[in-house]
């Protein structure tokens, strides 16, 4: 019967006793940077070409005996997971292997860098179809390795990497911390984070999604027909590399940004038990388990968005945090979050010709996060409209006044140290949903976009009594672009988007009391693109 991991990534409409995905990734080449491999294994023979590239350090220890089957173990298994005939994800994908890890599974940054350069040169000499590079390795943070990944990604290559098996923040490791790389954590058959001895899968904001990574059956280098179970984020990354190969084979023109958004969109949502992660990492870690799309075509009509968290600002008074979207993505809204509740809001600002989301810490605050909502919106023209603090008691308000521009997000930023504990709530005037409102001491920023067929609406959910969390979700067919809190009197810790739901967090109920002053309203801006929908109908 079908191994659990292949069943897990298969959408229900394709589920059967056997794994029969609609397309095998035959138009895509996957490069594997790992150990040597046993290329005559029946799973991968004829599918994996062993390149002449080898750059590995000497094995440690004088008593180390180089045994071929041990040297090949990791790479052979991963090659099988990606494209193996029997237990592979993308059964049609061809692969090329580069040896950058020695028989003990150790490599160097320089060896990996030279390997990436080898791929770049190969691509220039003989351009083929879409390329996926699988980096099932993790080492300490390396600016130079991340930069090399960025260069290759910007040349059109999709890089997929393991989050690392250190039960730690993936941002502390490379290439996992490179924003351009698709970073994959590992889950088990129960959709729980994988534990490996005393350690386990890495987590945090640098992880894009999770994938099966425990007890994964694949080719064993012991013999040409042998299979074995292995576990780790390498195996998880191999699943995503296989899924990416299949998506790219179905839609070869997909950009890295489009592919990443689709991987996120088609993932299983909210199935991971977040209690496994350290408390401060839960909100930052995506609750997503990779899956194949239910159909390899026809996803183009959707407006895809994802949430990008910044690094923590640090606790200094004037500290700021910046969240950025990928080059092909539009920043449609910006929010902020602070565990202490002491923050001075956020604003969208231009940086290097592109909008970024900047959050501001407040005096006495432990630091803030900036949260960007990054979307794929072709032919978009977006700008930020700002209203400075108002004189009037009605509060500050700003709307999209340009013809054809719609509101996609609201941000507010204030100079005073602590806003909201002693100010009366601001009520939005009825019949004026296409505007952002805020405290009179705050400057308000509206993200206004024009794109063919783009329409947006505001959806609110208010709770009169204090609640630690208030949510509002966009309905089917609409995508959450903006998430903010209507300024009330309770201490709002911040707002952020989780998939298609806007979450507003407040300080612990026990500290705010249960008066009407604790009212919190979550405001979601939900958008859709009629233009994209029509375009996809024409294509089908």
């Amino acid at each position: 019967s079908i191994p659990w991991n292949l069943e897990r990534i298969t959408p229900p409409r394709y589920r059967a006793d056997e794994y029969q995905p609609p397309d095998g990734g035959s138009l895509v080449e996957v490069y594997l940077l790992d150990t040597s491999i046993q290329s005559d294994h029946r799973e991968i023979e004829g599918r994996v070409m062993v390149t002449d590239f080898e750059n590995v350090p000497e094995e440690d220890g004088t008593r180390f005996h180089r045994q071929a089957s041990k040297c090949d173990s990791h790479g052979t298994h991963l090659a099988g997971v990606v494209s193996g005939r029997d237990a592979g994800v993308a059964k049609g994908a061809s692969m090329r292997s580069l040896r950058v890890l020695n028989c003990q599974g150790k490599g160097t940054v320089s060896g990996t860098l030279i390997g990436l350069e080898f791929i770049r040169k190969s691509q220039l000499v003989q351009p083929v179809g879409p390329l996926v590079v699988l980096l099932p390795l993790a080492g300490g943070y390396s600016r130079v390795l991340n930069a090399a990944c960025q260069r290759l990604a910007r040349a059109g290559v999709v890089l997929v990497t393991a989050a690392g098996n250190f039960r730690d923040d993936a941002c502390l490791y490379s290439p996992a911390s490179a924003p351009e790389v698709i970073t994959v954590g590992a889950t088990n058959a129960q959709d729980q984070p994988v534990t490996l001895g005393t350690l386990g899968t890495n987590f945090g904001r640098c992880v894009d999604l999770f994938a099966p990574g425990e007890d994964i059956i694949g080719a064993s280098s012991d013999c040409s027909t042998c299979f074995v179970s292995q576990s780790g984020t390498s195996q998880a990354a191999a699943h995503v590399a296989g899924i990416a190969a299949m998506m790219l084979s179905a839609e070869p023109e997909l950009t890295l940004a489009e592919l990443r958004q689709r991987l996120i969109h088609f993932s299983a949502k909210d199935v991971i038990n977040e209690a496994w992660f350290p408390e401060d990492q839960r909100v930052l870690t995506p609750n997503l388990v990779a899956a194949l799309p239910p159909s390899t075509h026809g996803a183009g009509w959707q407006l895809f968005c994802r949430t990008v968290w910044s690094a923590h600002s640090g606790p200094t008074r004037m500290a700021t945090a910046v969240a950025r979207c990928a080059p092909d993505e539009e920043l449609l809204s910006c929010s902020s979050f602070s565990r202490s509740g002491k923050r001075r809001g956020e604003r969208m600002e231009a940086q290097g010709g592109k909008l970024v989301c900047r959050a501001h810490n407040a005096f006495g605050g432990e630091g803030v996060y900036a949260i960007a909502r990054c979307c794929l919106l072709p032919q978009a023209n977006c700008s930020v409209h700002t209203a400075p603090p108002a004189e009037a008691s009605m509060g500050t308000r700003v709307h999209c006044h340009q013809q054809g521009h719609v509101l996609t997000g609201c941000s507010s930023h204030w100079e005073v140290e602590d806003l909201g504990t002693h100010k009366p709530p601001v009520l939005r005037p009825r019949g004026q949903p296409n505007q952002c409102v805020g405290h009179r001491e705050a400057s308000i920023h509206a993200s206004c976009c024009h794109a063919p067929g783009l329409e947006c609406k505001v959806k609110e959910h208010g709770i009169p009594a204090p609640q630690e969390q208030v949510t509002v979700a966009c309905e089917e067919g609409w995508t959450l672009t903006g998430c903010s809190a209507l300024p009330g009197t309770s201490h709002v810790l911040g707002a952020y988007a989780v998939d298609n739901t806007c979450v507003v967090r407040s300080r612990d109920v026990s500290t705010t009391g249960s008066t009407s002053e604790g009212a919190v309203t979550a405001v979601a801006i939900c958008c859709r693109s009629r233009h994209l929908a029509q375009a996809s109908q024409e294509l089908q």
Epitope: D17, E18, E45, R85, D86, S220
Partner: antibody, heavy 119, light 113 residues
Framework: QVQLVQSGAEVKKPGESLKISCKGS????????ISWVRQMPGKGLEWMGI????????RYSPSFQGQVTISADKSISTAYLQWSSLKASDTAMYYC????????????WGQGTLVTVSS | DIVMTQSPDSLAVSLGERATINCRSS????????????LAWYQQKPGQPPKLLIY???TRESGVPDRFSGSGSGTDFTLTISSLQAEDVAVYYC?????????FGQGTKVEIK
Amino acid sequence: QVQLVQSGAEVKKPGESLKISCKGSGYSFTNYWISWVRQMPGKGLEWMGIIYPGDSYTRYSPSFQGQVTISADKSISTAYLQWSSLKASDTAMYYCARDYWYKPLFDIWGQGTLVTVSS
Amino acid sequence: DIVMTQSPDSLAVSLGERATINCRSSQSVLYSSNNKNYLAWYQQKPGQPPKLLIYWASTRESGVPDRFSGSGSGTDFTLTISSLQAEDVAVYYCQQYSSFPITFGQGTKVEIK
């Protein structure tokens, strides 16, 4: 149910060509390997080769390499064993067998095709 | 190639008695990564295709009576029929499936004494 059905018995002359078939049903033919096994009269089992119908990848036993050709047509869930020039020593019962990947062994067998080569 | 050698070539056992067949491989078929022996046993009755009895050297295929058992590891293996029944008259083959070419033993014919 899962089964492999082989083509009927053949009587041929030396030097003639022949293609026998093995049709799978009740399972995803593309995803399972098919082996061919020879059994000469009164003798034991000899593995000839294997094919993966998904991509028609084949492996042959050195004893049969160049002597026979194994192929498959996944659109009709059928594997084939063929000879371009038969010899009297090819007289035997030929079995196809499904190979289950995780326990690479033969869990389902065809009923066999008897090939007789005689002048 | 891995050569499989069975003994004896033939065996006559009384009904209800134990039958033991040995099989030796020219090299080990035990692999450390999953601690499995890549060895199977098949039964072939006259005029029928072979039938899988045992895999991984000792795991009984579903539907196979529990009087059939397999044991051994590495290079030496045994198929035991604990209490021979009339329907067990057949030729039994061992097979290694760890590497290509897949090879069978020459067969052991079991008859009733």
